[in-house]
Interface confidence: medium
Protein backbone atom coordinates (compact mmCIF):
# COMPACT_ATOMS: atom_id res chain seq x y z
CA UNK A 1 0.00 0.00 0.00
CA UNK A 2 1.00 3.66 0.05
CA UNK A 3 0.82 6.53 -2.38
CA UNK A 4 1.90 5.96 -5.92
CA UNK A 5 4.78 8.43 -5.78
CA UNK A 6 6.49 7.31 -2.57
CA UNK A 7 8.69 4.33 -1.89
CA UNK A 8 9.27 2.71 1.47
CA UNK A 9 12.63 3.10 3.14
CA UNK A 10 14.83 0.01 3.21
CA UNK A 11 18.17 -1.16 4.60
CA UNK A 12 17.44 0.47 7.96
CA UNK A 13 20.70 0.23 9.88
CA UNK A 14 21.79 1.32 13.34
CA UNK A 15 25.20 3.01 13.47
CA UNK A 16 26.29 3.47 17.06
CA UNK A 17 29.63 4.18 18.74
CA UNK A 18 29.96 4.89 22.46
CA UNK A 19 26.17 5.39 22.40
CA UNK A 20 26.24 8.12 19.73
CA UNK A 21 23.50 6.48 17.69
CA UNK A 22 22.30 7.22 14.18
CA UNK A 23 19.70 5.37 12.15
CA UNK A 24 20.55 5.19 8.44
CA UNK A 25 18.42 4.00 5.55
CA UNK A 26 17.95 4.06 1.78
CA UNK A 27 16.98 5.31 -0.79
CA UNK A 28 18.03 8.89 -1.37
CA UNK A 29 14.69 10.66 -1.66
CA UNK A 30 13.21 11.64 -4.97
CA UNK A 31 10.06 13.71 -4.54
CA UNK A 32 9.59 12.40 -1.03
CA UNK A 33 10.57 13.15 2.58
CA UNK A 34 10.96 11.03 5.70
CA UNK A 35 10.00 11.17 9.36
CA UNK A 36 11.46 8.78 11.93
CA UNK A 37 9.77 7.39 15.03
CA UNK A 38 11.45 5.57 17.90
CA UNK A 39 10.03 3.55 20.76
CA UNK A 40 10.99 1.11 23.45
CA UNK A 41 9.22 -2.25 23.43
CA UNK A 42 6.66 -1.03 25.93
CA UNK A 43 6.67 2.70 25.23
CA UNK A 44 4.97 5.18 22.95
CA UNK A 45 6.32 6.23 19.58
CA UNK A 46 8.22 9.53 19.50
CA UNK A 47 8.75 11.37 16.23
CA UNK A 48 12.17 12.72 15.22
CA UNK A 49 13.76 14.24 12.12
CA UNK A 50 10.47 15.57 10.76
CA UNK A 51 9.99 15.62 6.99
CA UNK A 52 13.67 15.35 6.25
CA UNK A 53 15.41 14.75 2.95
CA UNK A 54 18.32 13.16 4.81
CA UNK A 55 18.70 9.41 4.95
CA UNK A 56 19.91 9.39 8.51
CA UNK A 57 18.54 10.49 11.86
CA UNK A 58 20.46 11.05 15.08
CA UNK A 59 18.55 9.21 17.82
CA UNK A 60 21.20 9.59 20.51
CA UNK A 61 19.05 11.84 22.69
CA UNK A 62 16.42 9.11 22.90
CA UNK A 63 18.54 6.03 23.45
CA UNK A 64 20.78 7.58 26.12
CA UNK A 65 17.73 7.93 28.37
CA UNK A 66 18.19 4.23 29.08
CA UNK A 67 20.91 2.35 27.25
CA UNK A 68 19.71 -1.04 28.50
CA UNK A 69 16.29 -0.71 26.89
CA UNK A 70 15.58 -2.32 23.53
CA UNK A 71 14.55 0.20 20.88
CA UNK A 72 12.68 -0.05 17.62
CA UNK A 73 12.54 2.69 15.00
CA UNK A 74 10.46 3.14 11.89
CA UNK A 75 10.87 5.44 8.92
CA UNK A 76 7.80 6.96 7.27
CA UNK A 77 7.81 8.09 3.63
CA UNK A 78 5.71 11.06 2.52
CA UNK A 79 5.30 12.76 -0.87
CA UNK A 80 7.33 15.97 -0.94
CA UNK A 81 5.09 18.99 -0.49
CA UNK A 82 2.12 16.86 0.50
CA UNK A 83 3.00 15.38 3.85
CA UNK A 84 -0.63 14.96 4.86
CA UNK A 85 -1.14 12.45 2.07
CA UNK A 86 -1.57 8.85 3.17
CA UNK A 87 -1.61 5.48 1.52
CA UNK A 88 -4.62 3.33 0.75
CA UNK A 89 -4.41 1.80 4.23
CA UNK A 90 -4.89 5.26 5.72
CA UNK A 91 -1.33 5.90 6.81
CA UNK A 92 1.97 6.67 5.10
CA UNK A 93 4.35 3.96 4.02
CA UNK A 94 6.82 2.96 6.70
CA UNK A 95 9.49 0.38 7.36
CA UNK A 96 10.64 -0.99 10.73
CA UNK A 97 14.25 -1.10 11.85
CA UNK A 98 15.84 -4.10 13.51
CA UNK A 99 15.67 -4.01 17.30
CA UNK A 100 18.59 -2.26 18.96
CA UNK A 101 19.82 -2.54 22.55
CA UNK A 102 22.56 0.08 22.98
CA UNK A 103 24.27 -1.55 25.97
CA UNK A 104 24.65 -4.81 24.08
CA UNK A 105 25.37 -3.44 20.62
CA UNK A 106 26.94 0.02 20.53
CA UNK A 107 30.43 -0.11 19.06
CA UNK A 108 33.30 0.69 21.37
CA UNK A 109 35.09 3.79 20.13
CA UNK A 110 38.81 3.87 19.53
CA UNK A 111 40.47 4.40 22.91
CA UNK A 112 43.28 6.85 23.58
CA UNK A 113 46.35 6.40 25.73
CA UNK A 114 46.25 9.33 28.11
CA UNK A 115 49.71 8.94 29.59
CA UNK A 116 52.47 6.58 30.54
CA UNK A 117 54.98 6.94 33.32
CA UNK A 118 58.12 4.90 33.86
CA UNK A 119 59.47 4.32 37.33
CA UNK A 120 62.53 2.10 37.13
CA UNK A 121 61.52 -1.17 35.49
CA UNK A 122 57.78 -0.49 35.79
CA UNK A 123 55.58 1.51 33.44
CA UNK A 124 52.12 2.76 34.38
CA UNK A 125 49.94 3.20 31.28
CA UNK A 126 46.68 5.11 31.67
CA UNK A 127 43.78 4.91 29.21
CA UNK A 128 41.60 7.98 28.78
CA UNK A 129 38.16 7.33 30.27
CA UNK A 130 36.19 8.49 27.30
CA UNK A 131 33.08 10.55 27.89
CA UNK A 132 29.80 9.27 26.44
CA UNK A 133 26.56 11.12 25.79
CA UNK A 134 24.81 9.12 28.50
CA UNK A 135 23.76 11.43 31.34
CA UNK A 136 23.08 10.92 35.02
CA UNK A 137 22.20 13.83 37.31
CA UNK A 138 23.07 16.28 34.52
CA UNK A 139 26.57 14.83 34.18
CA UNK A 140 27.91 12.97 31.17
CA UNK A 141 29.04 9.49 32.12
CA UNK A 142 32.30 7.93 31.01
CA UNK A 143 32.51 4.60 29.24
CA UNK A 144 33.66 3.06 32.53
CA UNK A 145 30.73 4.63 34.40
CA UNK A 146 28.30 2.99 31.97
CA UNK A 147 29.86 -0.44 31.52
CA UNK A 148 31.51 -0.90 34.89
CA UNK A 149 33.23 -4.25 35.20
CA UNK A 150 31.84 -5.46 31.87
CA UNK A 151 34.53 -3.33 30.17
CA UNK A 152 38.19 -4.28 30.12
CA UNK A 153 41.18 -2.89 28.26
CA UNK A 154 43.88 -4.91 26.57
CA UNK A 155 47.33 -3.37 26.30
CA UNK A 156 49.71 -4.42 23.54
CA UNK A 157 53.31 -3.43 24.16
CA UNK A 158 56.62 -4.15 22.51
CA UNK A 159 60.20 -2.99 22.45
CA UNK A 160 60.76 -0.29 19.85
CA UNK A 161 63.62 -2.40 18.57
CA UNK A 162 61.55 -5.57 17.98
CA UNK A 163 58.14 -6.69 16.79
CA UNK A 164 57.33 -9.30 19.46
CA UNK A 165 54.19 -8.08 21.23
CA UNK A 166 53.18 -8.74 24.80
CA UNK A 167 49.71 -8.19 26.22
CA UNK A 168 48.20 -7.18 29.55
CA UNK A 169 44.58 -6.76 30.63
CA UNK A 170 42.86 -4.57 33.19
CA UNK A 171 39.30 -3.91 34.32
CA UNK A 172 40.30 -0.44 35.45
CA UNK A 173 41.84 2.17 33.13
CA UNK A 174 45.41 1.59 34.26
CA UNK A 175 48.12 -0.94 33.55
CA UNK A 176 51.30 -1.52 35.52
CA UNK A 177 53.76 -3.54 33.47
CA UNK A 178 57.35 -4.70 33.81
CA UNK A 179 59.85 -3.45 31.25
CA UNK A 180 63.55 -3.92 30.66
CA UNK A 181 65.66 -1.05 31.89
CA UNK A 182 67.11 1.11 29.17
CA UNK A 183 64.66 -0.12 26.51
CA UNK A 184 62.06 2.04 24.80
CA UNK A 185 58.60 0.51 24.41
CA UNK A 186 55.56 1.23 22.26
CA UNK A 187 51.97 0.84 23.43
CA UNK A 188 48.53 0.40 21.95
CA UNK A 189 45.27 -0.35 23.77
CA UNK A 190 41.94 -1.86 22.82
CA UNK A 191 38.62 -1.66 24.65
CA UNK A 192 36.92 -5.05 25.05
CA UNK A 193 33.64 -6.31 26.45
CA UNK A 194 34.50 -10.02 26.72
CA UNK A 195 30.99 -11.26 27.40
CA UNK A 196 29.41 -9.67 24.35
CA UNK A 197 28.42 -11.72 21.34
CA UNK A 198 28.74 -8.82 18.87
CA UNK A 199 30.93 -5.72 18.74
CA UNK A 200 33.21 -7.10 21.43
CA UNK A 201 36.30 -5.04 20.61
CA UNK A 202 37.20 -1.51 19.63
CA UNK A 203 39.79 -0.68 17.05
CA UNK A 204 43.29 -0.29 18.46
CA UNK A 205 44.31 3.08 19.85
CA UNK A 206 47.00 5.08 18.09
CA UNK A 207 50.44 3.77 18.99
CA UNK A 208 52.37 5.77 21.59
CA UNK A 209 56.07 5.19 22.13
CA UNK A 210 58.44 6.01 24.94
CA UNK A 211 60.80 8.83 24.09
CA UNK A 212 57.95 10.86 22.62
CA UNK A 213 55.92 13.73 24.10
CA UNK A 214 53.19 11.82 25.95
CA UNK A 215 55.21 9.96 28.55
CA UNK A 216 57.00 10.86 31.73
CA UNK A 217 60.17 9.06 32.75
CA UNK A 218 61.66 8.85 36.20
CA UNK A 219 64.70 6.79 36.98
CA UNK A 220 64.87 5.46 40.51
Amino acid sequence: SGTTNTVAAYNLTWKSTNFKTILEWEPKPVNQVYTVQISTKSGDWKSKCFYTTDTECDLTDEIVKDVKQTYLARVFSYPAGNVESTGSAGEPLYENSPEFTPYLETNLGQPTIQSFEQVGTKVNVTVEDERTLVRRNNTFLSLRDVFGKDLIYTLYYWKSSSSGKKTAKTNTNEFLIDVDKGENYCFSVQAVIPSRTVNRKSTDSPVECMGQEKGEFREI
Epitope: K41, S42, D66, K68, Q69, T70, T101, Y103, L104, K149, D150, I152, K169, T170, N171, I193, P194, S195, R196
Partner: antibody, heavy 118, light 107 residues
Framework: EVQLVQSGAEVKKPGASVKVSCKAS????????MNWVRQAPGQGLEWMGE????????TYNQKFKARVTMTVDQSTSTVYMELSSLRSEDTAVYYC???????????WGQGTTVTVSS | SIVMTQSPDSLAVSLGERATINCKAS??????IAWYQQKPGQSPKLLIY???NRYTGVPDRFSGSGYGTDFTLTISSLQAEDVAVYYC?????????FGGGTKVEIK
Protein backbone atom coordinates in the same frame (compact mmCIF):
# COMPACT_ATOMS: atom_id res chain seq x y z
CA GLU B 1 28.23 -26.18 24.78
CA VAL B 2 28.67 -24.14 27.96
CA GLN B 3 28.92 -26.32 31.05
CA LEU B 4 29.52 -25.60 34.71
CA VAL B 5 30.22 -28.78 36.67
CA GLN B 6 30.36 -28.58 40.45
CA SER B 7 31.94 -30.86 43.04
CA GLY B 8 29.91 -33.37 45.01
CA ALA B 9 27.84 -33.09 48.19
CA GLU B 10 29.59 -32.35 51.49
CA VAL B 11 28.68 -33.00 55.13
CA LYS B 12 30.50 -30.79 57.62
CA LYS B 13 30.56 -30.17 61.36
CA PRO B 14 29.80 -26.72 62.78
CA GLY B 15 32.93 -24.56 62.84
CA ALA B 16 34.54 -26.41 59.93
CA SER B 17 35.19 -25.07 56.41
CA VAL B 18 33.98 -26.29 53.03
CA LYS B 19 35.49 -25.71 49.59
CA VAL B 20 33.25 -26.16 46.57
CA SER B 21 34.62 -26.23 43.01
CA CYS B 22 33.04 -25.25 39.71
CA LYS B 23 34.73 -26.36 36.48
CA ALA B 24 33.80 -24.39 33.37
CA SER B 25 33.98 -25.53 29.77
CA UNK B 26 32.64 -24.62 26.36
CA UNK B 27 33.50 -20.92 26.42
CA UNK B 28 36.27 -18.40 27.05
CA UNK B 29 36.72 -18.92 30.78
CA UNK B 30 38.41 -15.59 31.49
CA UNK B 31 35.76 -13.57 29.68
CA UNK B 32 32.93 -13.92 32.21
CA UNK B 33 32.54 -13.26 35.91
CA MET B 34 31.63 -16.31 37.98
CA ASN B 35 29.16 -15.88 40.81
CA TRP B 36 28.12 -18.00 43.75
CA VAL B 37 24.48 -18.16 44.84
CA ARG B 38 23.09 -20.32 47.62
CA GLN B 39 19.65 -21.69 48.42
CA ALA B 40 18.69 -22.98 51.85
CA PRO B 41 16.14 -25.84 51.94
CA GLY B 42 12.74 -24.55 50.85
CA GLN B 43 14.09 -20.99 50.66
CA GLY B 44 14.93 -18.44 47.99
CA LEU B 45 18.19 -17.51 46.30
CA GLU B 46 20.96 -15.52 47.97
CA TRP B 47 23.95 -14.01 46.17
CA MET B 48 27.29 -14.59 47.90
CA GLY B 49 29.82 -12.94 45.63
CA GLU B 50 31.64 -13.04 42.31
CA UNK B 51 35.14 -13.51 40.97
CA UNK B 52 36.82 -12.27 37.82
CA UNK B 53 38.61 -15.35 36.40
CA UNK B 54 40.91 -13.10 34.38
CA UNK B 55 42.37 -11.25 37.37
CA UNK B 56 41.28 -13.25 40.39
CA UNK B 57 39.68 -10.12 41.85
CA UNK B 58 36.51 -10.75 43.80
CA THR B 59 33.51 -8.89 45.24
CA TYR B 60 31.63 -10.37 48.19
CA ASN B 61 28.21 -9.82 49.69
CA GLN B 62 28.85 -8.01 52.97
CA LYS B 63 26.92 -10.73 54.79
CA PHE B 64 29.58 -13.33 53.89
CA LYS B 65 32.67 -11.14 53.59
CA ALA B 66 34.32 -12.34 56.80
CA ARG B 67 33.83 -16.04 55.98
CA VAL B 68 33.99 -16.52 52.22
CA THR B 69 36.96 -16.76 49.87
CA MET B 70 36.68 -17.19 46.11
CA THR B 71 39.68 -18.29 44.07
CA VAL B 72 40.42 -19.30 40.50
CA ASP B 73 42.69 -21.76 38.74
CA GLN B 74 43.00 -20.64 35.13
CA SER B 75 44.96 -23.75 34.14
CA THR B 76 41.93 -25.94 34.83
CA SER B 77 39.18 -23.32 34.22
CA THR B 78 37.95 -23.88 37.74
CA VAL B 79 36.67 -21.48 40.38
CA TYR B 80 36.44 -22.29 44.07
CA MET B 81 34.28 -21.00 46.88
CA GLU B 82 35.43 -21.65 50.44
CA LEU B 83 33.12 -20.89 53.36
CA SER B 84 34.57 -21.05 56.86
CA SER B 85 33.16 -21.15 60.42
CA LEU B 86 30.19 -23.15 59.21
CA ARG B 87 26.95 -23.14 61.17
CA SER B 88 23.71 -25.05 60.74
CA GLU B 89 22.08 -22.20 58.83
CA ASP B 90 24.75 -22.60 56.11
CA THR B 91 23.06 -25.87 55.12
CA ALA B 92 22.08 -25.14 51.53
CA VAL B 93 22.60 -25.90 47.87
CA TYR B 94 25.47 -23.78 46.55
CA TYR B 95 25.43 -22.83 42.86
CA CYS B 96 28.06 -21.28 40.64
CA UNK B 97 26.57 -19.11 37.91
CA UNK B 98 28.11 -17.28 34.97
CA UNK B 99 27.27 -13.60 34.85
CA UNK B 100 26.27 -12.44 31.39
CA UNK B 101 26.85 -8.97 30.00
CA UNK B 102 24.87 -6.48 32.03
CA UNK B 103 24.28 -8.64 35.06
CA UNK B 104 21.96 -11.66 34.66
CA UNK B 105 23.12 -15.21 35.40
CA UNK B 106 22.83 -17.12 32.13
CA UNK B 107 24.39 -20.46 33.03
CA TRP B 108 24.24 -22.28 36.35
CA GLY B 109 26.08 -25.27 37.76
CA GLN B 110 24.06 -28.28 38.92
CA GLY B 111 24.47 -27.24 42.55
CA THR B 112 26.42 -28.68 45.49
CA THR B 113 24.56 -29.66 48.64
CA VAL B 114 26.40 -28.70 51.81
CA THR B 115 24.98 -30.06 55.05
CA VAL B 116 26.21 -28.67 58.36
CA SER B 117 25.33 -30.95 61.24
CA SER B 118 26.86 -31.99 64.52
CA SER C 1 20.94 -3.27 49.69
CA ILE C 2 17.92 -3.27 47.40
CA VAL C 3 15.01 -5.40 48.61
CA MET C 4 12.96 -7.25 45.99
CA THR C 5 9.40 -8.17 46.98
CA GLN C 6 7.50 -10.68 44.86
CA SER C 7 3.76 -11.27 44.80
CA PRO C 8 1.87 -13.47 45.06
CA ASP C 9 3.75 -16.16 46.97
CA SER C 10 1.89 -18.82 44.98
CA LEU C 11 -0.41 -18.87 42.01
CA ALA C 12 -2.74 -21.56 40.61
CA VAL C 13 -3.72 -21.09 36.97
CA SER C 14 -5.62 -23.30 34.53
CA LEU C 15 -3.76 -24.72 31.54
CA GLY C 16 -3.83 -22.26 28.65
CA GLU C 17 -4.64 -19.32 30.94
CA ARG C 18 -2.48 -16.29 31.72
CA ALA C 19 -0.22 -16.17 34.77
CA THR C 20 1.09 -12.84 36.08
CA ILE C 21 3.83 -12.42 38.68
CA ASN C 22 4.79 -9.08 40.18
CA CYS C 23 8.09 -7.86 41.57
CA LYS C 24 8.66 -4.60 43.42
CA ALA C 25 12.07 -3.06 44.13
CA SER C 26 12.67 -0.96 47.25
CA UNK C 27 14.28 1.70 45.05
CA UNK C 28 14.54 2.35 41.32
CA UNK C 29 16.57 -0.26 39.44
CA UNK C 30 15.93 1.24 35.99
CA UNK C 31 15.31 -1.89 33.90
CA UNK C 32 18.00 -3.94 35.66
CA ILE C 33 15.75 -6.90 36.31
CA ALA C 34 16.10 -10.57 35.39
CA TRP C 35 13.57 -13.37 35.82
CA TYR C 36 14.44 -17.02 36.50
CA GLN C 37 12.50 -20.28 36.45
CA GLN C 38 13.41 -23.06 38.87
CA LYS C 39 11.81 -26.48 38.61
CA PRO C 40 11.96 -28.91 41.55
CA GLY C 41 15.43 -30.40 41.96
CA GLN C 42 16.90 -28.26 39.18
CA SER C 43 19.10 -25.18 38.91
CA PRO C 44 17.47 -21.86 38.05
CA LYS C 45 17.19 -20.94 34.37
CA LEU C 46 17.33 -17.39 33.01
CA LEU C 47 14.14 -16.35 31.23
CA ILE C 48 14.21 -12.56 30.91
CA TYR C 49 16.93 -9.93 31.24
CA UNK C 50 16.88 -6.12 31.05
CA UNK C 51 13.26 -6.44 32.27
CA UNK C 52 11.81 -7.34 28.88
CA ASN C 53 14.37 -9.22 26.75
CA ARG C 54 13.79 -12.96 26.34
CA TYR C 55 16.93 -15.02 26.82
CA THR C 56 18.06 -17.40 24.09
CA GLY C 57 15.68 -20.33 23.59
CA VAL C 58 12.96 -19.04 25.92
CA PRO C 59 9.44 -19.57 24.48
CA ASP C 60 7.63 -16.38 23.49
CA ARG C 61 4.77 -17.09 25.90
CA PHE C 62 7.11 -15.64 28.54
CA SER C 63 7.30 -11.85 28.58
CA GLY C 64 8.55 -9.24 30.99
CA SER C 65 7.66 -5.60 31.47
CA GLY C 66 8.19 -2.73 33.87
CA TYR C 67 10.65 -0.01 34.71
CA GLY C 68 11.91 1.68 37.86
CA THR C 69 10.40 -0.18 40.81
CA ASP C 70 7.51 -2.26 39.43
CA PHE C 71 7.97 -5.27 37.18
CA THR C 72 5.84 -8.08 35.82
CA LEU C 73 6.51 -11.52 34.39
CA THR C 74 3.66 -12.86 32.27
CA ILE C 75 3.12 -16.38 31.00
CA SER C 76 0.50 -15.79 28.31
CA SER C 77 -0.74 -19.38 28.06
CA LEU C 78 0.34 -21.66 30.88
CA GLN C 79 1.72 -25.06 29.87
CA ALA C 80 2.22 -28.08 32.12
CA GLU C 81 6.00 -27.69 31.86
CA ASP C 82 5.77 -24.15 33.28
CA VAL C 83 5.03 -25.45 36.80
CA ALA C 84 7.96 -24.04 38.78
CA VAL C 85 9.09 -21.33 41.17
CA TYR C 86 9.86 -18.00 39.50
CA TYR C 87 12.33 -15.47 40.91
CA CYS C 88 13.07 -11.87 40.01
CA UNK C 89 16.57 -10.50 40.55
CA UNK C 90 17.93 -6.97 40.37
CA UNK C 91 21.30 -6.61 38.67
CA UNK C 92 21.34 -2.83 38.93
CA UNK C 93 23.34 -2.42 42.13
CA UNK C 94 25.58 -4.81 44.06
CA UNK C 95 24.84 -6.83 46.10
CA UNK C 96 22.59 -8.48 43.54
CA UNK C 97 19.36 -9.47 45.28
CA PHE C 98 16.50 -11.84 44.52
CA GLY C 99 12.80 -11.79 45.24
CA GLY C 100 11.40 -14.46 47.53
CA GLY C 101 9.93 -16.50 44.66
CA THR C 102 6.45 -17.25 43.32
CA LYS C 103 5.28 -20.85 43.01
CA VAL C 104 3.16 -21.43 39.90
CA GLU C 105 0.88 -24.48 39.89
CA ILE C 106 -1.92 -25.80 37.70
CA LYS C 107 -5.46 -25.24 38.90
Amino acid sequence: EVQLVQSGAEVKKPGASVKVSCKASGYSFTGYYMNWVRQAPGQGLEWMGEINPSTGGSTYNQKFKARVTMTVDQSTSTVYMELSSLRSEDTAVYYCARRELGGPFGYWGQGTTVTVSS
Amino acid sequence: SIVMTQSPDSLAVSLGERATINCKASQSVSNGIAWYQQKPGQSPKLLIYFASNRYTGVPDRFSGSGYGTDFTLTISSLQAEDVAVYYCQQDYSSPWTFGGGTKVEIK
